[in-house]
């Protein structure tokens, strides 16, 4: 079953390579066990970034070596994405599926394009 | 009719890896159901080993995740288990199931796989 | 994890008996409890799904019955290929869980 899914259209890295951004879905039933998935689009290739399972009104546990790190509030879950540079600007998409208890609902945004500019490197200073 | 084809038997030594297949025909795989896949030891119940979504999620138990992975080819329709680091516990009938998105159970079971584990 | 227990473990009927097998679980699970009848090498059969409703193709001397903690199977009128092991089996939470089952052996 679809789900709709809403994400921002575009967001700008900071300076540190950190991106955040909002993906809110509209649940049609009432999950306790939610999976976000993000995904990158670049070159209309698909690959995944990261990915957590989270029950209701917990925390959203990513592995440990994730990019990604998130909060969720009802519909809500809010993702961070750290260590970016110029070349991982891109399509950020992202992915929710409603896994338990079932009926099983999918739902996809239709991306946050995320653009990174690396700093300038500091000048040397005498 | 809806059927669940899978692989035939497997001999395996301690610390081997075996990867059961499952060919589904007589529905579209793409919509509607997900691949589940259970294992039964001799003379013991049944034990959930993991599922794969049409969306291509994954889900496992806790504790077979760190040695299983399950994977799903489309155009084939064909699913794949496979479980690694295998031990003597490990010998059991493995089967694979269709199973409707609206509820969770499973309605198609293929005809079942026996991995033994001997040294 | 859920735990699934049923009860009892075994039980002895003769053809024609009213039969009734319990499942209960540690936690709520609303309806999503299913049932299944194995045959020895056979894979199992689903009977019930969403704690009441039959399968396709299954008799309606099988019925199902509850909610949250505790589950029935109930087989109205025993037939001679009714004498298996049957199972329940939760969907409410991951991972998946079964019961330990329930040999239906021949008085």
């Known amino acids: 079953k679809a789900m709709h899914v809403a994400q921002p259209a575009v967001v700008l890295a900071s300076s540190r390579g950190i991106a955040s951004f909002v993906c809110e879905y509209a649940s049609p039933g009432k999950a306790t066990e939610v999976r976000v998935t993000v995904l990158r689009q670049a070159d209309s290739q698909v690959t995944e970034v990261c990915a957590a399972t989270y029950m209701m009104g917990n925390e959203l546990t990513f592995l440990d070596d994730s990019i990604c790190t998130g909060t969720s509030s009802g519909n809500q879950v809010n993702l961070t994405i750290q260590g970016l540079r110029a070349m991982d600007t891109g399509l950020y998409i992202c992915k929710v599926e409603l896994m338990y208890p079932p009926p099983y609902y999918l739902g996809i945004g239709n991306g946050t394009q995320i653009y990174v500019i690396d700093p300038e490197p500091c000048p040397d200073s005498d | 009719q809806v059927q669940l084809v899978q692989s035939g038997a497997e001999v395996k030594k301690p610390g081997s890896s075996v990867k059961v297949s499952c060919k589904a025909s007589?529905?579209?795989?793409?919509?509607?159901?997900?691949w589940g896949w259970i294992r039964q030891a001799p003379g013991q119940g049944l034990e959930w080993i993991g599922a794969?979504?049409?969306?291509?999620?994954?889900y496992y138990s806790p504790s077979l995740k760190s040695r299983v992975t399950i994977t799903a080819d489309k155009s084939t329709s064909t699913a794949y288990m496979e479980l690694s680091s295998l031990r003597s516990e490990d010998t059991a009938v493995y089967y694979c199931?269709?199973?409707?998105?609206?509820?969770?159970?499973?309605?198609?079971w293929g005809q079942g796989t026996l991995v033994t584990v001997s040294s | 994890d859920i735990q699934l227990t049923q009860s009892p473990s075994s039980l002895s009927a003769s053809v024609g008996d009213r039969v009734t097998i319990t499942c209960r679980a540690s936690q709520s699970v609303s309806r999503y409890l299913a049932w299944y009848q194995q045959k020895p090498g056979k894979a199992p059969k689903l009977l019930i799904y969403?704690?009441?409703n039959r399968a396709t193709g299954i008799p309606s001397r099988f019925s199902g019955s509850g909610s949250g903690t505790d589950f029935t199977l109930t087989i109205s009128s025993l037939q001679p290929e009714d004498f298996a092991t049957y199972y329940c089996q939760q969907y409410y939470r991951s991972p998946i869980t079964f019961g330990q089952g329930t040999k239906v052996e021949i008085k």
């Open positions: 794969i979504y049409h969306s291509g999620s994954t």
């Open positions: 007589g529905y579209s795989i793409t919509s509607g159901y997900h």
């Open positions: 969403d704690a009441s």
């Open positions: 199931a269709r199973g409707p998105l609206s509820y969770y159970a499973f309605d198609y």
